[in-house]
Interface confidence: medium
Amino acid sequence: EAYKSEIAHRYNDLGEEHFRGLVLVAFSQYLQQCPFEDHVKLAKEVTEFAKACAAEESGANCDKSLHTLFGDKLCTVASLRDKYGDMADCCEKQEPDRNECFLAHKDDNPGFPPLVAPEPDALCAAFQDNEQLFLGKYLYEIARRHPYFYAPELLYYAQQYKGVFAECCQAADKAACLGPKIEALREKVLLSSAKERFKCASLQKFGDRAFKAWSVARLSQRFPKADFAEISKVVTDLTKVHKECCHGDLLECADDRADLAKYMCENQDSISTKLKECCDKPVLEKSQCLAEVERDELPGDLPSLAADFVEDKEVCKNYQEAKDVFLGTFLYEYARRHPEYSVSLLLRLAKEYEATLEKCCATDDPPTCYAKVLDEFKPLVDEPQNLVKTNCELFEKLGEYGFQNALLVRYTKKAPQVSTPTLVEVSRKLGKVGTKCCKKPESERMSCAEDFLSVVLNRLCVLHEKTPVSERVTKCCSESLVNRRPCFSGLEVDETYVPKEFNAETFTFHADLCTLPEAEKQVKKQTALVELLKHKPKATDEQLKTVMGDFGAFVEKCCAAENKEGCFSEEGPKLVAAAQAALV
């Protein structure tokens, strides 16, 4: 159905509150440096305009596309050239080039300081004084730090955030109530951001086909009772939703996501027995619930895969006449039977099956050629299983911090050219896989670990793309989405690396280290570890363990000293000298 006014259509569909929130998120993701007040003003003006168009669709400019309206609005910002430099040149372009230009300037690492919450009393006063402004600030702060955050999900998290304050600001001990709840929400938000960034990278770097394959595998695992036609329909709609959000079309994205939730609830009988509870909720909670819904039970009577994909004499004919549909069916059938496999592994198996058919269907006797194809999957399955087993054993032995340090050493040796903050951030996140996945039952470990690693390694790829410094990282990031993790796992020590010159400044510490929260203290130590490795890449694990132990003792000693700063300036150089001697 064609609408006279696109903006009125979205305003009517989404309602004023969600519409305004999404516009605020969109502007904050595009113009990440602008102050909150400017964005509130822009969002208010756009919402007022949309409201007017909803009342009178043939009003002036109501027929313009959303990109035109939003782009025109962004280009009215006076400080565009000062704050954003060449992003201002985007305003010289016409749509759709102008929007593409804005998208290209989104900064995945804007370098804002971490959000520090004020005192609970001050927070509650702000919340109670102006709830709408308070939640708007939350949307703004998250959106500008995460320019690819999944916008409808961010509205959901803002709602959760509101619930936390509504509850805790009534509590006797506000701090005790807020602390753990805000931290739990923060963890969810960070994971959500990374997951959506992975989806956007899949679409932008590898195209619709890669994203659809990923979604077919994931949804087939989750909804094994749904047939392939149903899975395909949901995947097609889901692809459209994520393409829109990744492309900055947040109103269309949120609207289409709501439509998809409606469709799934209307057709739950043919999708999953687990959707009922989700479908009774309001739209934001409903969509979120559907996205997180537990896996349905497998149908009991699934025939052997071999019947259709190996033994059937028509395999090559079916494959050659509609390759993607046939491979999609294979992926669907394999995934619904193997909820314990990671999506990445399932996609590798589908790729292997495709390669086998490409080869075998060109021979004189295809059935003999592909007869053992399913048996040939074994090494592909064993590799992530062994990797998870080995790393979980290491995690259980070392704990999260020790495991992170082991990964820091591993990844710094693989790609020492990568910036130290990136190596620390990525290795810390990789280390969290232990905490997140190793305590899960065997049947869930691989899926949890490998799919989480894919998301974290995507962060490395995104950061590295901004300033490429390592050919091997570029190669692992760009050759194949499903083989990224095995590619990184397979990287050995970079023997071509020329050690970094020693810089005493890098290893100079001050008394402010003592007052840092534990996590930030760890980051400081881990930063030193990476710098040490860049200076002495041939250092053995034993040597590094000794030096890091000494470093920990030094920090503890000086933080307990009467004259902390004096201790740091006196003992620090001695420690550095001892470390250099130990690492010769």
Epitope: D227, F228, A229, E230, D312, A322, T329
Partner: nanobody
Framework: EVQLLESGGGLVQPGGSLRLSCAAS????????VAWFRQAPGKEREFVAG????????TYADSVKGRFTISRDNSKNTLYLQMNSLRPEDTAVYYC???????????????????WGQGTLVTVSS
């Protein structure tokens, strides 16, 4: 659930033609892999022809290739089997079978089809 109802069977002379129909309800036929099987008295049920869901990929048993044509009309949610140059050995009860949500895969193995019609008898005799 898919319900299938065959029609169009009957008595025909050798060399003659018949067109069988299979009306489907409960599911769109274009989303479904559908096939015709037949069973002669005292024999196993055998695959005759199949057509994939979503993409019209057709498959035939060697014994009917060039004589039989499988097709479907999505608007009528109906599957057809046009049978020409009929022979006495084509005498059998013809069944329509469906595998919902399985584009392409028109397997020749009867056990893989969960939905069946009640059959229509075709007799080829002079």
């Amino acid at each position: 659930e898919v319900q299938l109802l065959e029609s169009g069977g009957g008595l025909v002379q050798p060399g003659g033609s018949l067109r069988l129909s299979c009306a489907a309800s409960g599911r769109y036929i274009d989303e479904t892999a559908v096939a015709w099987f037949r069973q002669a008295p005292g024999k196993e049920r055998e695959f005759v022809a199949g057509i994939g869901g979503g993409v019209d990929i057709t498959t035939y048993a060697d014994s009917v290739k060039g004589r039989f044509t499988i097709s479907r009309d999505n608007s009528k949610n109906t599957l057809y089997l046009q049978m020409n140059s009929l022979r006495p050995e084509d005498t059998a009860v013809y069944y329509c079978a469906a595998r919902p949500g399985r584009p392409l895969i028109t397997s020749k193995v009867a056990d893989l089809y969960p939905y069946w019609g009640q059959g229509t008898l075709v007799t080829v005799s002079s």
